[in-house]
């Protein structure tokens, strides 16, 4: 069937479109076209005759029409007046004809649409405002844009005309955006300029910062307002009710206690005509005096005194504050606070107690602090302790020795042989001794302000012979590689050697031993069972030598990995099960079993008689050791057969 | 269920010995060791020493040294605990009590006890 | 020897209480504790061992802590049937010491 298609339908203004012919018989003469859906004289267009190839205008050709040999026609320089229908009569050689009827839509290009407003400074929560997109143009569709977005649900958004109006109700400072409109028709599509819609609003209610409103005698006052409004408001501030000043900032130095008070701000917008104000009540507080500390012991004795720490001046309607050594005050039943914490004894003072001290008195800005109190408390004397640690010296060497005792004020010493008084010094000094120099060494401290003395006696031998050593050590049970042990060959001796056998043997060489102080200390680390041996020591000098007791260690071990005897994992039927298991381990480690997962006895050995195929499954023992904190486990399948079958016994 | 039965009570003059007896039942004789503890009037709990009735090894307590014997027999699953030389001080309940497995264990199942009384 | 003190030597506390008794080893005896309930003119019963562990049966508001030289009996909410004297004792070789003893008696 003879058809027409149009391509494009609609068309632009100015463009072009062609008139395609489908299905165009065989055998033509040749063929007309009309303006209109039928055939009229009136309203030829063209008409084409094939044998000759010559194409005749109509009375409705207007020169921008083009006909080819396929029958299509094309027109050129659309008007608006070429819209609608288009119709082909086909002559065909038998003289029978055809007709076939097309049409295309014209539309003009749109122009650049742009924006009118009823209202270019609405005013928030009063004014409405109406968007119009201009011009108007017929079978053309009209959308909004805010802010490149399509419009947002809202009961305050409004279209009308046909969506060529947009009405803002009750505008809000949020409407303050870009808006566009756009236009569209089959042929094209236009966008307006963004138009910026100037909301009026505010003032807020103002803010003043800062938010402080307590203030020191001295302090500048320096007092900030904001509120939001478009334009931006204008700023009074007002004292007690009182015009200052139109500007956003006040200020005023040296303030005193006359410049407490309600401080206003109001804020004004011109153009909304509209007023805020907020009020803030600033306290100027007068400088409270520095605060002092008193004592009614200056030179408390430990142990004995207890010392009141007032905090002066005396204020009424005041916290008092302590601090010790720049801390808070500690919990101690010996720290008592006066009920209204004004004055801190200390109860039976002690040497640790000297401080310093800090009293403060607050008021509501801050918290004025004391100079820092010392306490000189009065203390020891502790035990003397007298050095070098050396008991044994060998006849001929100069003795000497140094006494010391913790004290204050320092303690004076005095020196006894035997109970006989030697000389009042904290030093001895015996040159070349002998051994009628043997005897009691008493060191006696006296502090002249507590009256109290202590003494310390330290026996010394004299002797060519050396003593018989002993060993001491720091860990009596390491655990194995873990711990480290530090023997030492007591006691410590002048001008002597210092020697050292594990099981007979000088010791080995080993980056696990390590000998210091002299070699009178052997460190073993990170022990092993291996090291549970005999230590002993020796000390030797150019006249004697003596050997110590053998120490030996107790290394906690494993457990190891236990082992489940007999191997045997298949049994018939009938016989007895008897499962002994064992690990290494120091101390013996506690034995459990179970049996497929069942906990069973806590023994060596598992026994049960008569077993059959239900007492087949996994047979775990597990091993602990408290000591070391460790455990370990091994599991056992065992296999029941019944008596008729014989397997052989596999490990 | 674990049964631990103790001989009667037993009256016994200074310089004498006597032997307690415990039965056990309920489980196997020779996996569990047996200790002996007593208690005097009125007085707390100590403890005397040990036996693995497998082996027969024993471990007694230093201050009973040389006046105690523990024994066993398999057959009877019994243990036997006598203490000689008596003295008044010597006066307590004396119980068997299993331990609970086999090295480092306390003491899960206890006899009724048994009352020994040394008097002249 | 191992040394085990207990404390205090006896207590009395109401129904619903609870109740801590303390044991104190001479020496690190690492977990090996154990602690036993013994009843007037009756066998000592085990509650607890090393240190933590519940005998199967015993109520679970008994409960043992610690290691090393410290260890503690706690009774969550005393009973009627919780008065006894309650003994510590250590598992760690030989020779097994026991504590004095704490008698637990209702106000």
């Known amino acids: 069937k003879l058809t027409i298609e149009s391509t494009p339908f609609n068309v632009a203004e100015g463009k072009e479109v062609l008139l395609l012919v489908h299905n165009l018989p065989q055998h033509l003469f040749g063929y007309s076209w009309y303006k209109g859906e039928r055939v009229d004289g009136n309203r030829q267009i063209i008409g084409y005759v094939i044998g000759t190839q010559q194409a005749t205008p109509g009375p409705a050709y207007s020169g921008r029409e083009i006909i080819y040999p396929n029958a299509s026609l094309l027109i050129q320089n659309i008007i608006q007046n070429d819209t609608g229908f288009y119709t082909l009569h086909v002559i065909k050689s038998d003289l029978v004809n055809e007709e076939a009827t097309g049409q295309f839509r014209v539309y003009p290009e749109l122009p650049k649409p742009s924006i009118s407003s009823n209202n270019s400074k609405p005013v928030e929560d009063k004014d409405a405002v109406a968007f119009t997109c201009e011009p108007e143009t017929q079978d053309a569709t009209y959308l909004w844009w805010v802010n490149n977005q399509s419009l947002p649900v809202s009961p305050r958004l409004q279209l009308s005309n046909g969506n060529r109006t947009l009405t803002l109700f009750n505008v809000t400072r949020n409407d303050t955006a870009s808006y566009k409109c756009e236009t569209q028709n089959p042929v094209s599509a236009r966008r307006s300029d963004s138009v910026i819609l100037n909301v009026l609003y505010g003032p807020d209610a103002p803010t003043i910062s800062p938010l402080n409103t307590s203030y020191r005698s001295g302090e500048n006052l320096n007092l900030s307002c904001h509120a939001a409004s478009n334009p931006p408001a204008q700023y009074s501030w007002f004292v007690n009710g009182t015009f200052q000043q139109s500007t956003q900032e006040l200020f005023i130095p040296n303030i005193t206690v006359n410049n407490s008070g309600s401080y206003t701000c109001q804020a004004h917008n011109s153009d909304t005509g509209l007023n805020r104000t907020t009020v803030t009540t600033i306290t100027v507080y007068a400088e409270p005096p520095k605060p002092f500390i008193t004592s009614n012991n200056s030179n408390p004795v430990e142990d004995e005194d207890a010392v009141a720490l007032t905090c002066e001046p005396e204020i009424q309607n005041t916290t008092y504050l302590w601090w010790v050594n720049n801390q808070s005050l500690p919990v101690s039943p010996r720290l008592q606070l006066s009920n209204d914490n004004r004055t801190l004894t200390l109860l039976s003072v002690t040497r640790n107690d000297v401080g310093p001290y800090e009293c403060g008195i607050q008021n509501e800005l801050s918290v004025d602090h004391s100079d820092p109190v010392i306490l000189n408390v009065l203390y020891g004397p502790d035990d003397p302790t007298i050095s070098p640690s050396y008991t044994y010296y060998r006849p001929g060497v100069n003795l000497s020795l140094s006494c010391h005792a913790a004290s204050n004020p320092p303690a004076q010493y005095s020196w006894l042989i035997d109970g006989n008084i030697q000389q009042h010094t904290q030093e001895l000094f015996i040159s070349n001794i002998t051994e009628k120099n043997s005897g009691l060494y008493t060191c006696q401290a006296n502090n002249s302000a507590s009256g109290h003395s202590r003494t310390t006696v330290k026996t010394i031998t004299v002797s060519a012979e050396l003593p018989k050593p002993s060993i001491s050590s720091n860990n009596s049970k390491p655990v194995e590689d873990k711990d480290a042990v530090a023997f030492t060959c007591e006691p410590e001796a002048q001008n002597t050697t210092y020697l050292w056998w594990v099981n007979g043997q000088s010791l080995p060489v080993s980056p696990r031993l390590q000998l210091s102080n002299g070699n009178r200390t052997l460190t073993l680390f990170n022990v092993t069972r291996n090291d549970a041996r005999a230590y002993v020591c020796g000390i030797q000098n150019s006249v004697s030598a003596n050997r110590s007791d053998p120490v030996t260690l107790d290394v906690l071990y494993g457990p190891d990995t236990p082992i489940i005897s007999p191997p045997d994992s298949s049994y018939l039927s009938g016989a007895n099960l008897n499962l002994s298991c064992h690990s290494a381990s120091n101390p013996s480690p506690q034995y459990s079993w179970r049996i497929n997962g069942i906990p069973q006895q806590h023994t060596q050995v598992l026994f049960i008689a008569k077993i059959t195929p239900n007492n087949n499954g996994t047979y775990a023992c597990f091993v602990s050791n408290l000591a070391t904190g460790r455990n370990n486990s091994i599991v056992k399948s065992i296999t029941v057969s019944a008596s008729g079958t014989s397997p052989g016994l596999s490990a | 269920q674990v049964q631990l039965v103790q001989s009667g009570a037993e009256v016994k003059k200074p310089g004498a010995s006597v032997k307690v007896s415990c039965k056990a039942s309920g489980y196997i004789f020779t996996s569990y060791w047996l200790h002996w503890v007593r208690q005097a009037p009125g007085q707390g709990l100590e403890w005397i020493g040990y036996?693995?009735?497998?082996?027969?090894?024993?471990n007694y307590s230093q201050k009973f040294q040389g006046r105690v014997t523990m024994t066993r027999d398999t057959s009877t699953s019994t243990a036997y605990m006598e203490l000689s030389s008596l003295r008044s001080e010597d006066t307590a309940v004396y119980y068997c009590a299993r331990e609970y497995g086999n090295y480092n264990y306390p003491l899960d199942y206890w006899g009724q006890g048994t009352l020994v009384t040394v008097s002249s | 020897d191992i040394q085990m003190t207990q404390s205090p030597s006896s207590l009395s506390a109401s129904v619903g209480d609870r109740v801590t008794i303390t044991c104190r080893a001479s020496?690190?005896?690492?977990?090996?504790l154990a602690w036993y309930q013994q009843k007037p003119g009756k066998s000592p019963k085990l509650l607890i061992y090393?240190?933590?562990n519940l005998v199967e049966g015993v109520p679970s508001r008994f409960s043992g802590s610690g290691s090393g030289t410290d260890f503690t009996l706690t009774i969550s909410s005393l009973q009627p049937e919780d008065v006894a004297t309650y003994y510590c004792?250590?598992?760690?070789?030989?020779?097994?010491?026991f504590g004095q003893g704490t008698k637990v008696e209702i106000k």
């Open positions: 036996i693995n009735p497998n082996t027969g090894y024993t």
């Open positions: 020496e690190n005896i690492y977990g090996y």
């Open positions: 090393n240190a933590k």
């Open positions: 004792q250590h598992h760690y070789g030989t020779p097994y010491t």
